[in-house]
Amino acid sequence: ELPKPSISSNNSKPVEDKDAVAFTCEPEAQNTTYLWWVNGQSLPVSPRLQLSNGNRTLTLFNVTRNDARAYVCGIQNSVSANRSDPVTLDVLYGPDTPIISPPDSSYLSGANLNLSCHSASNPSPQYSWRINGIPQQHTQVLFIAKITPNNNGTYACFVSNLATGRNNSIVKSITVSASGTSPGLSA
């Protein structure tokens, strides 16, 4: 009788748009059919998926974050069959272009400025801010109490993913008007 199979991988943490991953269904057995499923479904037709080695090896080329799914292999012969436990692929990606919220760019003097930066990334990225090119704290949220027109300028959020070796950033212009002189928003 066939044993419960297992899945081995040549790359446990592939990087999006860069790496390939080869899953192999163990053990190797003669006169055995090897089958694969992704998230409980049969393999989709895709030029990035390739079966080889008598269907025992499943290769994903140029992995994307959408490939971070549960992979299962099965083995079957004329007298028995069995399926592996699922193996979930951990795809490293990002950081994507960050988003600064709220989207407001005009503020009244005396308001609190509370900017949050978010970037899709696995693992979570490191965040840092620069105001008019000057480095600020390494936090996801930038808070400045009671802003004045002196706080006018460009606010840049920088994100870095050490696992993928990639960086990204976005710049936002902030205008602070003296109280009562602008219809700008008050935070």
């Epitope: 059919t33 089958l35 409980g40 479904q41 099965g74 079957q76 069959a81 069995n82 399926r83």
Partner: nanobody, 120 residues
Framework: EVQLVESGGGLVQPGGSLRLSCAAS????????MGWFRQAPGKEREFVAS????????YATDSVKTRFTISRDSAKTTVYLQMNSLRPEDTAVYYC?????????????WGQGTQVTVSS
């Protein structure tokens, strides 16, 4: 030894209903697909329906899908085939089977079969 034990077959009039059951002797079947094949006199054995390990179902034809319903118990070791609106052409020996992707690959595990006869 692995065993699949079927029950529920019999003689029924056209338009009637039957419920087939198939119990597996081992818990490893929770990781396998279970389903039903049938063989009419003088014909080859054909796939009817299956319940996959992941909770999906597959049916041979739309005609079967509209009249038959396959289901599985929570332990995934017993499979049922509820057959409604039976027709004379449904007369066959119905076999329970277990394996991987039953509709595409010949399964390794088979029951002994249960006779279903639709006749007035």
């Amino acid at each position: 030894e692995v065993q699949l034990v079927e029950s529920g077959g019999g003689l029924v009039q056209p338009g009637g209903s039957l419920r087939l059951s198939c119990a597996a002797s081992r818990g490893t079947f929770s990781r396998l697909d279970m389903g039903w094949f049938r063989q009419a006199p003088g014909k080859e054995r054909e796939f009817v329906a299956s319940s996959t390990w992941s909770g999906g179902t597959a049916y041979a034809t739309d005609s079967v899908k509209t009249r038959f319903t396959i289901s599985r118990d929570s332990a995934k070791t017993t499979v049922y085939l509820q057959m409604n609106s039976l027709r004379p052409e449904d007369t066959a020996v119905y076999y329970c089977a277990a394996g991987l992707s039953l509709e595409q690959h010949t399964p390794p595990y088979w029951g002994q079969g249960t006779q279903v006869t639709v006749s007035s």
